[in-house]
Amino acid sequence: IWELKKDVYVVELDWYPDAPGEMVVLTCDTPEEDGITWTLDQSSEVLGSGKTLTIQVKEFGDAGQYTCHKGGEVLSHSLLLLHKKEDGIWSTDILKDQKEPKNKTFLRCEAKNYSGRFTCWWLTTISTDLTFSVKSSRGSSDPQGVTCGAATLSAERVRGDNKEYEYSVECQEDSACPAAEESLPIEVMVDAVHKLKYENYTSSFFIRDIIKPDPPKNLQLKPLKNSRQVEVSWEYPDTWSTPHSYFSLTFCVQVQGKSKREKKDRVFTDKTSATVICRKNASISVRAQDRYYSSSWSEWASVPCS
Amino acid sequence: VPGGSSPAWTQCQQLSQKLCTLAWSAHPLVGHMDLREEGDEETTNDVPHIQCGDGCDPQGLRDNSQFCLQRIHQGLIFYEKLLGSDIFTGEPSLLPDSPVGQLHASLLGLSQLLQPEGHHWETQQIPSLSPSQPWQRLLLRFKILRSLQAFVAVAARVFAHGAATLSP
């Protein structure tokens, strides 16, 4: 058993049929010695008396808010949550496996630049009695600070018969060094509590591996005289790290016909302009990627040829 | 470059960008080892990293690029030695046309651009990683190239910025 926060405790249980469970001793936080009784949740049934209560925690029915009283007055509370371990693996019932980029991916994170700011998100089908708390650090043995905000519900989607809820959190490394080569990964830890079930999820990454620039901005076409060619130009996204002579991007320019089956013409360039042939009803799209490290491409910025 | 002269920024920029390309093309070819969730120890603690105080940021380069260039040179020599070691030359053999050979030569080329014959910066000892099994070599190749990708990305940014802002 360990303390999650004041008066909230997590009991770690090996979860299998007829498991013996864990013996837990609760102590009433009071100077009083006599006349103390214990109850669980809203029930008035007295579970025991005395300053300590010993219970055998085996299942969710044994978890909940234990309260010690004296003469009708509440002295203190202890909330017990359960953390299930099945076959040596902690349960992951609360969050959905996003399966990208690999199985058992519950947390996904992205950064728009090298400033040390990043966003993580996760999915669940649970709509109520759900709380999240997020902590982060750079490295684990001698951790350097990363500050995370509160997790918020950022999207709701309908998936078949189910509703899916997306939560996200923004974090910022306290002393980020954008130009340095990272040697210790960022660690992100999410505590999830659903009713009386506790679970924790972790992710470990380098900022360089989760970079995804915003799409190029101000995408414009300039027809070239007496030609089907156009000059496409664009700019670095505002959110990208500066100076651009140091934090350089590379770009992919694509000409795509109306039909998805039509052949796509693609050009790669380090410049912020390119000359392409504009076909009727086609569109021109541009996306960006770090020039020197193959992290994710940005989403496409697009304009119609006409 | 030692003694404060300026490097051939544009040449260094071109070669470092080539190194980036080679490091990424070599990576999947060293032998597939699916190591997603493995590696609770940092393999690359022993390798030289370009750290915050090394003056490789735009401001540090403007003030005095020598500290940064020395750090980059150290790293290039270090990785050049690793790529020439038993880790990459031992079993399992790399294919004759593997980009690792080009990568090795390019690391040497860039280090020589930074330190012509007759000048000497101190270099870092390469650690004894001592893989005795072929799959241990495979694992280390995988991790060394991952680490090299990060190192050459920073070096390429330094030379691109130098070529754009510090070239005479």
Epitope: - | G31, E38, G39, E42, Q133
Partner: antibody, heavy 119, light 111 residues
Amino acid sequence: QVQLKESGPVLVAPSQSLSITCTVSGFSLNNFAISWVRQPPGKGLEWLGAIWTGGGTNYNSALKSRLSISKDNSKSQVFLKMNSLQTDDTARYYCVRKDYSYGGAMDYWGQGTSVTVSS
Amino acid sequence: DIALTQSPASLAVSLGQRATISCRASETINFYGTSFMHWYQQKPGQSPKLLIYRASNLESGIPARFSGSGSRTDFTLTINPVEADDVATYYCQQTNEDPYTFGGGTKLEIK
């Protein structure tokens, strides 16, 4: 599909030599290492030695002086030679494929050949 | 040589229950964060078959009832739920150092 087939079975007199050939199909000896493993009747498994993709070998130190492994890539064959056999060398001898990307795990096994050392 | 000690030597489990087999190494078999420990199943009269490689990776075609965990010196093979077809002897093996040693085996039976 991947297959490994050992020659035999073999009956050997004590102090004599043993030769087994393993013929593989469905993969190339240029890309995979081969190990030999034996199992005495009713007992556990013992690794004997391996031949790498490049032709290098390594052997169980306890048997090194009596053991030799070689191969012919063009014929997809691996050879095990063992001399000075004693009765405790009686076992089922398996030819096994080792996968480097699996960390040297043995992902395909032959059906084994029975070797009996008896006078 | 690295000695691998498997326990228990034999195990009887009811159908649908969980079987846990332990393998302890005499020295660490981690190399830069990767554990070169593998698990095999050998049914009577058959050749061994790879189940788990590098401590926790399930070989393709093996049911997800089989799982491996552990690192350094302590490793576990779990079968949950056990089926009648799982009656066999299970071996652990390390390939971190040669000679590549096997555990003594654990015989699984149905109660």
